[in-house]
Interface confidence: medium
């Protein structure tokens, strides 16, 4: 062939037209041609259309072509593998009927920001999906249903920050699921269902222990020997299990499956048996699991914050384990928020007295307890975030902005990490400050109104700010998956305005509760 | 045809700041990954930074924390913001050119000198 | 981090020659799904920027002639020049682009017999 070189390798066809600054597929290739690689080309946009004629193609890999259109028309009843990967792809194509074949599907490295529900129909012969690297914050939750043959499936190196609990319902040939890297701060009660999930990689998360992380905390007990760190260049099943990879952001890095989950309502007459009615409730010390009792008593409809029932830590030892990190995805609209008191001994607050109730946002629909299977609306247009456009643009340096709020602690993982895309002029401060942090952890999806009519101390005296407040992302290591390199994210930043100089952000008050 | 120009080297002391730039122009600039890399005086080639099309920015160790790695697309230019500069920070600083993020380096400037000295 | 070690750190050789570098990867730097590997190799003269040869380990980039070939796959690649020119010599390195952070060989100096 003129411009591309034709090779046959057994009964392949294999055509190479990679690196010849195509603008559209080139003329007069082979009609049995099997294995069509296009990859590093200038196509733009591309019709799966052109490709009808060739009626034995298996695997067509357009990866990194700068692709922002792929039009789905006319149908590759035989196509097995497609590669996306590196485009500029900012929808999921809707490929069901084109491809009706499909078994391997790869659209790393793209602009998904969100997928719609019906994005995977058709796609019945589905056994791998990579979307590794995109900017997904939310999935709907039947995406994976027209899927039941998935093997593997990649959402790493995103921006989620929760899943839908039957995300993974019928897949009972998954064997391998990678999450790393995300901003997932729980997983939902039942989410892993029954089967048997071999590989699973969930580091890099910044997972709030809480009475909500109870499930998923049993899960990894349960499961701890199919709990990997991804390494680059090492096969899955010569990989070393490391469950205490996946890691409590908000408690010095405490290993999930051991979070010791003191105070946390038990299954009971008086509890809400909807809570965790998956696992009983645990105290682990140790390697030691012991069941445990606790007198707090819940209303059985209590509505749950993303750290779970919000005075569910221990008053034991407070210090160490309140959260003081921001977690997503607080709303950046201009709504009252309240800043409660961190719960310390030395006042009393009678549980049966405060109320849960979600209130309308102003600017969506009220949005579901995470500890449902509903999905989460996309968030609001005015979220403060650095989500990419198709024409990014990273602020220009200046020469003395604000210290980032990412602090580099160097981890055993051999890859880079993110930090804030806004230069700084000073380096980041010591984690070790004593100084209150300006920015105290927020509520995510649900919007919870406290009703608290009981004894609180003066030292609790509520504070009210307007500002707005925005994301801020833990700063993670990363680790390359599946053959593919690495993508990490940017620290979505915050800003509270002059908060540190605020004489009521007391070290005491820690949690934001949006109203 | 590609072009990449760096500017902003120059003598600084240990515990500085310098940003350095990179103006790109003879490509879309926006549709590509951009990197630094640096090569001390008589050493070998180290990657500094990169940056996505889509302006997610990756850093190695050495100097995590420390450098800032951005771009303004409406200018073509790419950034490195160096703070708390060290002594073994001194190197010609390249700026290049990749398809995506983990592809090899297909265009390189001809490089920027910093120094760091007291 | 993958380490890549490059030998011989230098070498002698006159115009015509035949020269062979090779590089070595502390793991595989092949992608499974593609069966491409991801090793880059450069050549730098003094005083100049490094200028891409090969990619995917076989891959001449455009305008780069022929007499350089890549070859090698897993752990093990090499670089030739069949048949070595005066405006070839310089000093040569290899780079992975597989897993991140990216590492270069330390170079090898091709210098004149």
């Known amino acids: 062939h003129p411009i591309c070189e034709v090779s046959k390798v057994a009964s392949h066809l294999e055509v190479n037209c990679d690196k010849r600054n195509l603008t559209a597929l080139p003329p007069d290739l082979p009609k049995d041609t099997t294995i069509l690689h296009l990859s590093e080309n200038l196509l733009y946009t591309f019709s799966l259309a052109t490709l009808m004629p060739y009626t034995r193609l298996t695997q067509l890999n357009l990866d990194r072509c700068e692709l922002t259109k792929l039009q789905v028309d006319g149908t590759l009843p035989v196509l097995g593998t497609l590669d996306l990967s590196h485009n500029q792809l900012q929808s999921l194509p809707l490929l069901g009927q084109t491809l009706p074949a499909l078994t391997v599907l790869d659209v790393s490295f793209n602009r998904l920001t969100s997928l719609p529900l019906g994005a995977l129909r058709g796609l019945g012969e589905l056994q791998e999906l990579y979307l590794k690297g995109n900017e997904l914050k939310t999935l709907p939750p039947g995406l994976l249903t027209p899927t039941p043959k998935l093997e593997k499936l990649s959402l790493a190196n995103n921006n989620l920050t929760e899943l839908p609990a039957g995300l993974l319902n019928g897949l009972e040939n998954l064997d391998t699921l990678l999450l790393q890297e995300n901003s997932l701060y729980t997983i939902p009660k039942g989410f892993f269902g029954s089967h048997l999930l071999p590989f699973a990689f969930l580091h890099g998360n910044p997972w709030l222990c809480n009475c909500e992380i109870l499930y998923f905390r049993r899960w990894l007990q349960d499961n701890a020997e199919n709990v990997y760190v991804w390494k680059q260049g090492v096969d899955v099943k010569a990989m070393t299990s490391n469950v205490a990879s996946v890691q409590c952001d908000n408690s010095d890095k405490f290993p999930v499956y051991k979070y010791p989950g003191k105070g946390c309502p038990t299954l009971g007459d008086e509890g809400d048996t909807d809570l965790y009615d998956y696992y009983p409730e645990e105290d682990t010390e140790g390697d030691k699991v012991r069941a445990t009792r606790t007198v707090v008593k819940f209303p059985t409809k209590a509505h749950t914050t993303p750290w779970g029932l919000f005075y569910s830590w221990s008053t034991a030892s407070l210090d160490s384990q309140m959260p003081s990190s921001l977690h997503p995805t607080q709303e950046s609209t201009k709504e009252q928020t309240t800043f409660p008191p961190r719960w310390t001994p030395n006042f009393t607050l009678h549980m049966e007295s405060i109320t849960f109730s979600k209130t309308p946002k102003s600017t969506t629909e009220p949005t579901p307890s995470p500890t449902t299977s509903e999905p989460v609306p996309e968030p609001a247009p005015n979220m403060t975030t650095l989500e990419p456009t198709p024409s990014p643009t990273t602020p220009e340096p200046t020469s003395e902005p604000a210290p980032s709020p990412t602090t580099p602690e160097p981890t055993s993982e051999p890859a880079p990490s993110p930090t804030t895309p806004e230069p700084t002029s000073e380096p980041a401060p010591s984690p070790t400050t004593p100084e209150p942090t300006p920015i105290p952890t927020i509520a995510t999806s649900p919007t919870i109104l406290v009703s608290a009519t009981s004894l609180i101390t003066p030292k609790s005296t509520f504070l009210t700010t307007t500002k707005p407040v925005s994301l801020l992302e833990s700063t993670k290591k990363t680790i390359p998956e599946l053959d593919q390199p690495p993508k990490l994210r940017g620290v979505l930043q915050g800003h509270l305005e002059s908060s540190r100089n605020d004489p009521f952000l007391h070290p005491d008050f820690c949690c934001l509760l949006p109203l | 045809q590609v072009q990449l120009v760096e500017s902003g080297g120059g003598v600084v002391q240990p515990g500085r700041s310098l940003r350095l730039s990179c103006a790109a122009s003879?490509?879309?600039?926006?549709?590509?990954?951009m990197s630094w890399v640096r090569q001390a005086p008589g050493k070998g080639l180290e990657w500094v930074a990169s940056?996505?099309?889509?302006?997610?920015?990756y850093y190695p160790d050495s100097v995590l924390g420390r450098f800032t790695i951005s771009r303004d697309n409406s200018k073509n230019t790419l950034y490195l913001q160096m703070n708390s500069l060290r002594a073994e920070d001194t190197a010609v600083y390249y700026c290049a050119r990749s398809r995506g993020y983990e592809d090899y380096f297909d265009y390189w400037g001809q490089g920027t000198l910093v120094t760091v000295s007291s | 981090d993958i380490q890549m070690t490059q030998s011989p750190s230098s070498l002698s050789a006159s115009v015509g020659d035949r020269v062979t570098i090779t590089c070595k990867s502390s793991?595989?730097?092949?992608?499974?799904?593609?069966?491409?590997?991801?090793l880059a190799w450069y050549q730098q003269k003094p005083g100049k920027a490094p200028k891409l040869l090969i990619y995917f380990t076989s891959t001449r980039e455009s305008g780069v002639p022929s007499r350089f070939s890549g070859s090698g796959s897993g752990t093990d690649f090499t670089l030739t020049i069949s048949s070595l020119q005066p405006e070839d010599f310089a000093t040569y390195y290899c780079?992975?682009?597989?897993?991140?952070?990216?590492?270069f060989g330390q170079g090898t100096k091709v210098e004149i017999k």
């Open positions: 003879g490509f879309t600039f926006s549709s590509f990954a």
């Open positions: 793991q595989s730097l092949l992608n499974s799904r593609n069966q491409k590997n991801y």
């Open positions: 780079q992975q682009h597989y897993s991140s952070p990216w590492t």
């Open positions: 940056i996505t099309s889509a302006g997610t920015p």
